[in-house]
Amino acid sequence: EVEKTACPSGKKAREIDESLIFYKKWELEACVDAALLATQMDRVNAIPFTYEQLDVLKHKLDELYPQGYPESVIQHLGYLFLKMSPEDIRKWNVTSLETLKALLEVNKGHEMSPQVATLIDRFVKGRGQLDKDTLDTLTAFYPGYLCSLSPEELSSVPPSSIWAVRPQDLDTCDPRQLDVLYPKARLAFQNMNGSEYFVKIQSFLGGAPTEDLKALSQQNVSMDLATFMKLRTDAVLPLTVAEVQKLLGPHVEGLKAEERHRPVRDWILRQRQDDLDTLGLGLQGGIPNGYLVLDLSMQEALS
């Protein structure tokens, strides 16, 4: 194998071009200068190198930049990005949104890998907060991105960025995350009129408190059952039958199909049966007439 370490005569690469496409691993290693590669990274992506060949090119860059690649190289990594480890990426300082977009484009179609998560983390930390342009970019590539953040991380999202959020971006968020996002959304959309406001706020309502749901019930919003089923149980329980009827409008009939599921099931248990009967839906399980309801949580608070 020793004789293979020298570049064969006439094979030394003068530029990164398609003539390298059938170079074997050892030929790429011996015949491609790392500094040349770094200055012509933009050409690599135009050549359909195999994964084996990309491994060699990565190795050459690693030797040239042991402390981490400069952004001028990172921006043009192309498919070579798929060969990077999170440890490689932690050495980078990515400040340009264009660089981030270029690398996310390469990863399009893949799940969010540990490499991408590390890249985003480095980028956002470098910026100090998740600004609107960054959030726009991230949710465009990864609709579930917001829901992958912890409530603590979400607290750094400025209300102005909420305008970039689409309903599908929140599909996998849990109540703790929506608790953080809802007040931001409320602030972001506060100057909108009733019906427009509801359209925008609807997907965030899993973080809404009881008083906001009561206020919405006065605005003829006709909330659909899917949204209602995602509301916080503790926020739904204090609503009266009349308030739920107003909140759901024509969709109130859907309660029957959901009567065994939370939060509908728990809400039914808190209502008087004769109030439930006024809906005419055959909902069962309410408090029988003549029973007294004690709010133990109020008693504990007073004592």
Partner: antibody
Framework: QVQLVESGGGLVKPGGSLRLSCAAS????????MSWIRQAPGKGLEWVSY????????YYADSVKGRFTISRDNAKNSLYLQMNSLRAEDTAVYYC???????????WGQGTLVTVSS | IQLTQSPSSLSASVGDRVTITCRAS??????LAWYQQKPGKAPKLLIY???SLESGVPSRFSGSGSGTDFTLTISSLQPEDFATYYC?????????FGGGTKVEIK
């Protein structure tokens, strides 16, 4: 939309020649590497030949080396395969396919049948 | 690099979960693509990088694996999925295909 249309197939005697063409449209042909892939009746796929975007770098499978010549004309958005000294085992449907950035075949033509028989 | 697909053919019903495997003669990282070919038609790219779905391909198709063992799964077989499926490696030149797996109606 992307279209690749092959032509030039037909019946030829052993030792004869054929020239296949592939007309491309709907994408920037000069940015793409192009390939010929063949499929013998009832068999699997075999990568036959490969040409770089400018036409300067070429690959042939051992089974066709010295007999087949791949070429392209970027001005005409066309790919060609000149097949000489044809043998019975060259009988197959020949597909042209495009390669962009990764060595995978993202677009394929509908194929043209080459039958080598006496 | 040789690719061996198994089974070479299988019979299944609409709604079935179908799994096809592709084994490489040496490690190929995640450099594997899957194609679907219907009778009389050209192959169509389904999956690349072992698990990435090509744009426009239904989500019932999924790929997995790395190294030498790879799997193509159809979660709920549809009438239009009866076809022959091929794997292809792009870890090193020359590019090679598996022998194919024909999915037939039971």
């Amino acid at each position: 939309q992307v279209q690749l249309v092959e032509s030039g197939g037909g019946l030829v005697k052993p030792g004869g020649s054929l020239r296949l063409s592939c007309a491309a449209s709907g994408f920037t042909f000069s940015d793409y590497y192009m390939s010929w892939i063949r499929q013998a009746p009832g068999k699997g796929l075999e990568w036959v030949s490969y040409i770089s975007s400018s036409g300067s770098t070429i690959y042939y499978a051992d089974s066709v080396k010295g007999r087949f010549t791949i070429s392209r004309d970027n001005a005409k958005n066309s790919l060609y395969l000149q097949m000489n000294s044809l043998r019975a085992e060259d009988t197959a449907v020949y597909y042209c396919a495009s390669v962009h950035k990764k060595p995978i075949f993202d677009y394929w033509g509908q194929g043209t049948l080459v039958t080598v028989s006496s | 690099i040789q690719l061996t697909q198994s089974p070479s053919s299988l019979s299944a019903s609409v709604g079935d979960r179908v799994t096809i495997t592709c084994r490489a003669s040496q490690g190929i990282s995640s450099a594997l693509a899957w194609y679907q070919q219907k009778p009389g038609k050209a192959p169509k790219l389904l999956i690349y990088d072992a698990s990435s779905l090509e744009s426009g391909v239904p989500s019932r198709f999924s790929g997995s694996g790395s190294g030498t063992d790879f799997t193509l799964t159809i979660s709920s077989l549809q009438p239009e999925d009866f076809a022959t499926y091929y794997c292809q490696q792009f870890n090193s030149y020359p590019l090679t295909f598996g022998g194919g797996t024909k999915v037939e109606i039971k």
